[in-house]
Amino acid sequence: AILGRSETQECLFFNANWEKDRTNQTGVEPCYGDKDKRRHCFATWKNISGSIEIVKQGCWLDDINCYDRTDCVEKKDSPEVYFCCCEGNMCNEKFSYFPEMEVTQPTSNPVTPKPP
């Protein structure tokens, strides 16, 4: 491991579509990847009339958009599906939205998934 970098070995797993996909609904996912490639965690969610609905959480393959991000933060302005990625074990437990292009003060929606 390189000093100062959080290696990702496991991420929080969640799948809202677990029955159709025939997976667990929630758990911990071990992350696999090629030698010399980094691993990350991700979260995806929707904002339905102000209500946060988690879609999926899990491991994400080597992606420079995620490098050195200890927090899972979506910065895109009003996406249809929110996505964030981060480095460090279980770093996707909490996620937030800070749009970069906002002129007004950005608001954060940190979310901790509630057990079903």
Epitope: K37, F42, V55, W60, N65, E80
Partner: antibody, heavy 115, light 111 residues
Framework: QVQLVQSGAEVKKPGSSVKVSCKAS????????INWVRQAPGQGLEWMGT????????SYAQKFQGRVTITADTSTSTAYMELSSLRSEDTAVYYC????????WGQGTLVTVSS | QSALTQPRSVSGSPGQSVTISCTGT?????????VNWYQQHPGKAPKLMIH???KRESGVPDRFSGSKSGNTASLTISGLQAEDEADYYC???????????FGGGTKLTVL
Amino acid sequence: QVQLVQSGAEVKKPGSSVKVSCKASGYKFTSSYINWVRQAPGQGLEWMGTINAVSGSTSYAQKFQGRVTITADTSTSTAYMELSSLRSEDTAVYYCARGGWFDYWGQGTLVTVSS
Amino acid sequence: QSALTQPRSVSGSPGQSVTISCTGTSSDVGSKNYVNWYQQHPGKAPKLMIHGVSKRESGVPDRFSGSKSGNTASLTISGLQAEDEADYYCGTFAGGKYYGVFGGGTKLTVL
């Protein structure tokens, strides 16, 4: 092992559309991007666009904006690239590739546009 | 994003070393470690050889190495072998906020 298997060759008329599929196996489809690249006969590689397989978010090269649509079906681990308003210059081999680094590639799909 | 610039062709004899350059700008190649190198044999799909400027893919011989100086990335192949004869492309990471771009390709001939 990671595999990307693409649909077969297509012959299309100018003005029509083509939809090429790319079925992924050997890894978790929703853990990365799928990129699409084309190569005209005797020419170099040309990046067309990308899709985040879990969120469905897409980015397209300016050249193809408005003419290309990339989608992903997570239930079948398959990505699709649809190119519309075809012209003869679109005759090329179309490739899908996994991830931002393009670390695994499909075998390619030859699309021939001819009247 | 404009294409990266590569020489059209390079050549070398077996056992020699060759270097292929890939020139971009200060806003792409110069500022980010996100250049990749691909090898393509005729009629085949490209194969990723090096990612992130200098990280060799598993299974790629250590005769292949990547580096960067300023706005130019380079692929060096030492101890040239006949099977190294192919087209080589540099390209950038693509996904999220990053848009992909390739160099025009370099034909390597082993004499």
